[in-house]
C-alpha cells in the first residue's frame, strides 16, 4: 500500500516515514519523496 499523506517510503528503513522528520534528517532517502 502507498504511504499515507505526509509520509514517504524509505527503502533504507523498509517502511513509510514521516516527512516531518526531514527537518531533522534532511538527507534521509525518503525525504526525496516529500514535497
Amino acid at each position: 500500500a502507498p504511504c499515507s499523506r505526509g509520509s514517504s517510503w524509505s527503502a533504507d528503513l523498509d517502511k513509510c516515514m514521516d516527512c516531518a522528520s526531514c527537518r531533522a534528517r534532511p538527507h534521509s532517502d525518503f525525504c526525496l519523496g516529500c514535497a
Partner: antibody
C-alpha cells in the same frame, strides 16, 4: 525485539562522579539519535543530552542544567551509549532513561537506572 | 526554553467514554506544514512509550482509539473509547528546538 538496557546507577556522594552505560539491540543503533532523559518527582521528565550520528560528526547537545558537567558519548561498534556525570548534586537524583529516536522524538526507551546523590 | 503546560493534571473517565488531554506551549511549535509535538504514555513502573509524533501521526502498533490534533500552541490527545489498560500518565513533548521539554503530565484513571 528492541531493547535498551541501562546500567551504572546507584548511590553517590555529593560532588562525586558516575558513568552510566546503555547497551542497545534490535534496531540499527548507528542510524539513531540517542539521548538521556531523567525523571524525578520534583522535575518530572527532563531531556538531558543528545548525540547524533557519525555523519553529523557525533554532534552533541545538552540541557543548560548539565552543560559542562555531563558528557554524552556513543560507541557504534558496541551499540553502546554513555553518560559521564561529574560534580553530582542532590538535584541530579532520579531515574535515568536511555532513549533512541530516528529523529527529534523518542522511539525507544530503556527501563531506566536509578541514581541517588546523598551523603 | 519552551514551557509545556498540560491540563488537567488528573482526570477520571468511565470505561468506553472519551478522555481529552490538553497541552499548551509557551510559543508556537508548528510550521505551515508540520507540528513538532509528541505524546507519550507511561504506565506505573514502566518507561514512557511513544504514542503520537508530529501532533497527529500514530506510532506503529498504537491502537486507533488514540488520536492527536492541534497546531501552533494548542494540542490535544484524545482517547476514545477508553479501555482499562489506558490508565497511565500522559506527557507531551516538543521538538521545535533544543532543549526538548516535556509537559508535567496528566494522570488518567478509569472507572
Amino acid at each position: 525485539e528492541v531493547k535498551l538496557e541501562e546500567s551504572g546507577g546507584g548511590l553517590v556522594q555529593p560532588g562525586g562522579s558516575m558513568k552510566l552505560s546503555c547497551v542497545a539491540s534490535g534496531f540499527t543503533f548507528n542510524n539513531y539519535w540517542m539521548s538521556w532523559v531523567r525523571q524525578s518527582p520534583e522535575k518530572g521528565l527532563e531531556w538531558l543530552a543528545e548525540i547524533r550520528l557519525k555523519s553529523d560528526n557525533y554532534a552533541t547537545h545538552y540541557a543548560e542544567s548539565v552543560k559542562g558537567k555531563f558528557t554524552i558519548s556513543r560507541d557504534d561498534s558496541k551499540s553502546r551509549l554513555y553518560l559521564q556525570m561529574n560534580n553530582l548534586r542532590a538535584e541530579n537524583t532520579g531515574i535515568y532513561y536511555c532513549t533512541g529516536g530516528f529523529a527529534d522524538y523518542f522511539d525507544y526507551w530503556g527501563q531506566g537506572t536509578t541514581l541517588t546523590v546523598s551523603s | 526554553d519552551i514551557v509545556l503546560t498540560q491540563s488537567p493534571a488528573s482526570l477520571t473517565v468511565s470505561l468506553g467514554q472519551r478522555a481529552t488531554i490538553s497541552c499548551r506551549a509557551s510559543q508556537s511549535v508548528s510550521t505551515s506544514s508540520y507540528s513538532y509535538m509528541q505524546w507519550y504514555q507511561q504506565r506505573p513502573g514502566q518507561p514512557p512509550k511513544l504514542l503520537i509524533k508530529y501532533a497527529t501521526n500514530l506510532d506503529s502498533g498504537v491502537p486507533a482509539r488514540f488520536s492527536g490534533s492541534g497546531s501552533g500552541t494548542d494540542f490535544t490527545l484524545n482517547i476514545h473509547p477508553v479501555e482499562e489498560e489506558d490508565a497511565a500518565t500522559y506527557y507531551c513533548q516538543h521538538s521545535w528546538e533544543i532543549p526538548y521539554t516535556f509537559g508535567g503530565g496528566t494522570k488518567l484513571e478509569i472507572k
